[in-house]
């Protein structure tokens, strides 16, 4: 069929459009967010001018007093549900916490994100505020917490109903007992990390990393998992923007890979299967009233009664339309043309949609494809500001500005910091540290043998696409003998306190070494001490590449291990062994890098890579393959995507972004006892 011109607009059944006039929208908005009182503004005769001027001033918009396009655009922007003027009614007290050890309870979860990702987003959001105040935040598991976090829809039990997708995203109450201090998130939103639906992968070679949407495969762009390039029908995705160049992938949740709960121990579906005498070749909701999709895990459910629930595919589960919750079907036919990805054809608003059967023309079943979603981390950080007593800011760049704005930069603005410090004061200077006593080392992780799915070898890759070796950057020749170069500090402008994220951090001798882009700094703890440097890595360790992933010193032998990509260099004094490939240490081809190390008894280390860890024998320079374990099993509460793990003063530090999670090990219980900034809290950098 000839290609449809963009001007062909189609009436989609079940497409909900608001019938509010601009005037009605404005009246509703001005009342809801505190700019007018109850019935003050109803009716065409009333002038909105004064209230609009108030709103424009508060939101730093051009102050025209008119319902102009900038004002209407602001009113249509997704935002926090807390009023801008006046409070959520009148709570008693001065609306700040009078203790500094704040507790929080995550009462329930959204199904949009894995629970560990939600836990992590909230922990990072709290860390923003603890980094600039004397407040600490501890997760508890009871409603006695100061801050209760809840996902809810519509009327969810607090008298402030949510409004469906978009619009009002979340709200929180000022400090105090009961509902006060609580933060509620609208679960009709798509919660993500701000850059599209989060789909964790299994197997493949990306260590469980989430899919990257969109991604390029064989020159084509994909915004959902695909079975292209495979003959076994397993959906997969790239975990970087370009599979063709990076070759990193994982398998998406699929009933062909595993099922959840049920009674079949997670075995994959068996298609076709017999249920009540009928044959099924896909998951079904038949026989259930709750809408859950399930399948048999043997060929005959009637005989074997073995089943599991089919995992949801967030990347292709539609929202709205007339098929909410169902999966896109690719390819589908629309106006006689075949589509293998979501499209905006037929719509005037540019929104992406898909059919949920193979033929829209005949079935008219459709829904919107997942959008970028809202960053749970950013929205939570904003709501927690309210839960600590902050009102909305009129500075558009501030975190406490009422409108949602995605940013990957540091979320806190000076206005936010000034506001929170007005309530609680600044973070106190670190006390001089008493002599440290050694704490018990982490014990060896439980022996867990990774088991692959029946039909997929863990390192299997999509059959199409280049599979060349990982590229190793140029490395200098192994050098023997002492280096003649002296380590002269470079320009003092190169201050460690200005470094956002270090490549690697390690305790060498009794000093902390911080590595970044071919340079390093040394730091000795003490009142008023500052990091020294930077020095050139090449002057001290000439064999090393500029970019390091992790570094550690083995105390007994004083050997220094430097990891970069799939390679390791071992320095003993000035002599070097390496580069050696990671497989020489017993780490398989699916381990792309070593992201950190911790001591684990005499001559033993724990090596980390993404979400996994291994026990490493320094003398034998070999990992015990049976010791492979999940990081969050041994260190619950640390982020999933740490880029560096190191030991300092007998405590373990897990770094993510500019933050660290400190774990103290007491009687085999590894507990996070502090979250802070590497620069401010370890290096004692000034905060301004």
């Amino acid at each position: 069929a000839p290609r449809q011109r963009q001007s062909t607009l189609v009436l989609f059944p079940g497409d909900l459009r608001t019938n509010l006039t601009d005037r009605q929208l404005a009246e509703e908005y001005l009342y809801r967010y505190g700019y007018t009182r109850v019935a003050e503004m109803r009716g065409e005769s009333k002038s909105l001018g004064p209230a609009l001027l108030l709103l424009q001033k508060q939101l730093s918009l051009p102050e025209t007093g008119e319902l102009d396009s900038a004002t209407l655009k602001a009113m249509r922007t997704p935002r926090c549900g807390v009023p801008d003027l006046g409070r959520f009614q009148t709570f008693e007290g001065d609306l700040k916490w009078h203790h500094h050890n704040i507790t929080y309870w995550i009462q329930n979860y959204s199904e949009d994100l894995p629970r560990a990702v939600i836990d992590d987003a909230f922990a990072r959001a709290f860390a923003l505020w603890s980094a600039v105040t004397p407040l600490t935040f501890t997760r508890v598991y009871s409603r006695d917490a100061d801050i209760v976090i809840q996902f809810g829809v519509a009327e969810h039990g607090d008298g402030y109903p949510f409004d469906g997708k978009d619009g009002l995203l979340a709200h929180a109450f000022p400090p105090g007992p009961g509902i006060q201090g609580d933060a509620h998130f609208d679960d009709d939103e798509l919660w993500s990390l701000g850059k599209g639906v989060v789909v964790p992968t299994r197997f493949g070679n990306a260590d469980g990393a989430a899919c990257h949407f969109p991604f390029i495969f064989e020159g084509r762009s994909y915004s959902a998992c695909t079975t292209d390039g495979r003959s076994d029908g397993l959906p997969w995705c790239s975990t970087t923007a370009n599979y063709d160049t990076d070759d990193r992938f994982g398998f998406c949740p699929s009933e062909r890979l595993y099922t959840q709960d049920g009674n079949a121990d997670g075995k994959p579906c068996q298609f076709p299967f017999i249920f009540q005498g009928q044959s099924y070749s896909a998951c079904t909701t038949d026989g259930r009233s709750d809408g859950y999709r399930w399948c048999a895990t043997t060929a005959n459910y009637d005989r074997d009664k073995l089943f599991g629930f089919c995992p949801t595919r967030a990347d292709s589960t539609v929202m709205g339309g007339n098929s909410a919750g169902e999966l896109c079907v690719f390819p589908f036919t629309f106006l006689g043309k075949e589509y293998s990805t979501c499209t905006s054809e037929g719509r005037g608003d540019g929104r992406l949609w898909c059919a949920t059967t193979s033929n829209f023309d005949s079935d008219k079943k459709w829904g919107f494809c997942p959008d970028q979603g809202y960053s749970l981390f950013l929205v939570a950080a904003h709501e927690f500001g309210h839960a600590l007593g902050l009102d909305h800011s009129s500075v558009p760049e501030a975190l406490m500005y009422p409108m949602y704005r995605f940013t990957e930069g540091p979320p806190l603005h000076k206005d936010d910091v000034n506001g929170i410090r007005h309530l609680y004061g600044p973070r106190p200077e670190p006390e001089p540290r008493p002599p440290t006593t050694t704490t018990p080392q982490p014990t060896a992780p439980p022996t867990v043998c990774p088991t692959g799915p029946p039909t997929v070898h863990p390192s299997e890759r999509p059959t199409a696409g280049p599979t060349g070796p990982p590229s190793a950057g140029p490395t200098g020749p192994p050098t023997a003998g002492p280096s003649t170069a002296t380590t002269v500090p470079l320009s003092p402008v190169d201050d460690a306190c200005n470094v956002n994220i270090f490549d690697a951090i390690a305790e060498i001798g009794n000093q902390l070494y911080l590595f970044k882009d071919g340079k390093y700094w040394r730091f000795s703890e003490g009142r008023g001490s500052r990091p020294q440097g930077p020095f050139l890595i090449a002057d001290k360790w000439p064999a090393l590449p500029r970019k390091l992933d992790s570094v550690f010193e083995e105390r007994l032998s004083k050997k220094l291990f430097f990891f970069s990509g799939r390679q390791v260099w071992v320095y003993t004094g000035a002599s070097v062994l390496g580069p050696r490939r990671l497989d020489k240490l017993g780490l398989g081809a699916d381990v792309a890098q070593v992201t950190g190390a911790l001591r684990s008894g005499r001559g033993k280390m724990l090596l980390f890579s993404g979400r996994r860890l291994w026990r490493f024998d320094v003398k034998a320079q070999m990992v015990d393959p049976r010791s492979a374990s999940e990081v969050d099993r041994m260190f619950p509460g640390v982020p999933l995507d740490t880029h560096d793990v190191f030991q300092y003063r007998e405590k373990a530090y897990f770094c993510q972004d500019r933050f660290y999670w400190r774990v103290s090990s007491r009687s085999e219980l590894n507990q996070v006892d502090q979250v802070g900034y590497v620069t401010y809290d370890i290096l004692q950098c000034p905060e301004d």
């Epitope: 329930n108 607090d158 402030y160 809408g291």
Partner: antibody, heavy 116, light 108 residues
């Protein structure tokens, strides 16, 4: 001690109205919501609705919409539930309960009998 | 209006373990959180378990709750004579609170 004390038993004729009170003590009244639940003789629990004491917003069970009104008086920390156009099947014990991720504190109950 | 379905009765001898189920008919209990209440004869109900599995202070640890897919469960291990009562599950569904029909637990 956190408690809710309800008004005494009522006997009403069909078509009449009843207003039950629930006085809270031992906690910050305006920081919680109040749910009303009733239980007909020999039957289970039926949720009637909810009022948030901090903003007086209400959420009523669909079945009772138009017949029930819930209010609060924050100066006396008291919640009220009024049910109009009473019928014989409204005969029940009426409970108020503090509602915060579960109804954790309950009043002793008020028996309302509707009989001609 | 959604309905939560509970078995009308359950029984056990002292020391036994009794489990009561609660399932949603037209909505997903597994994606909601469930509370459980105990009502002793002639008294007001008492919150026993909140948010699927949490016990308020003062509730003995022989009471435990769970919620998976479309069934929530209340378990009483080491049944005692004072546990003879009616037990109700409760959840939110589309802006309304819903109670189960109740389960009468008898200690034999």
């Amino acid at each position: 001690e956190v408690q809710l004390v309800q008004s005494g038993a009522e006997v009403k004729k069909p078509g009449a109205s009843v207003k039950v009170s629930c006085k809270a003590s031992g906690y910050t009244f305006t920081s919680y919501g109040i749910s009303w639940v009733r239980q007909a003789p020999g039957q289970g629990l039926e949720w009637m609705g909810y009022i948030s004491a901090y903003n007086a917003n209400t959420n009523y069970a669909q079945k009772l919409q138009g017949r029930v009104t819930m209010t609060t008086d924050t100066s006396t920390s008291t919640a009220y539930m009024e049910l109009r156009s009473l019928r014989s099947d409204d005969t029940a014990v009426y409970y108020c309960a503090r509602d915060y991720y579960g109804m954790d504190v309950w009043g002793q109950g008020t028996t309302v009998t509707v009989s001609s | 209006q959604a309905v939560l379905t509970q078995p009308p009765s359950a029984s056990g001898t002292p020391g036994q373990r009794v489990t009561i189920s609660c399932s949603g008919s037209t909505f997903n209990i597994g994606s909601n959180t469930v509370n459980w209440y105990q009502q002793l004869p002639g008294t007001a109900p008492k919150l026993l378990i909140y948010s699927d599995s949490h016990r308020p202070s003062g509730v003995p640890d022989r009471f435990s709750g769970s919620n998976s897919w479309n069934t929530a469960s209340l378990a009483i291990s080491g049944l005692q004579s004072e546990d003879e009562a009616d037990y109700y599950c409760q959840a939110w569904d589309s802006s309304a609170v819903v109670f189960g029909g109740g389960t009468k637990v008898t200690v034999l």
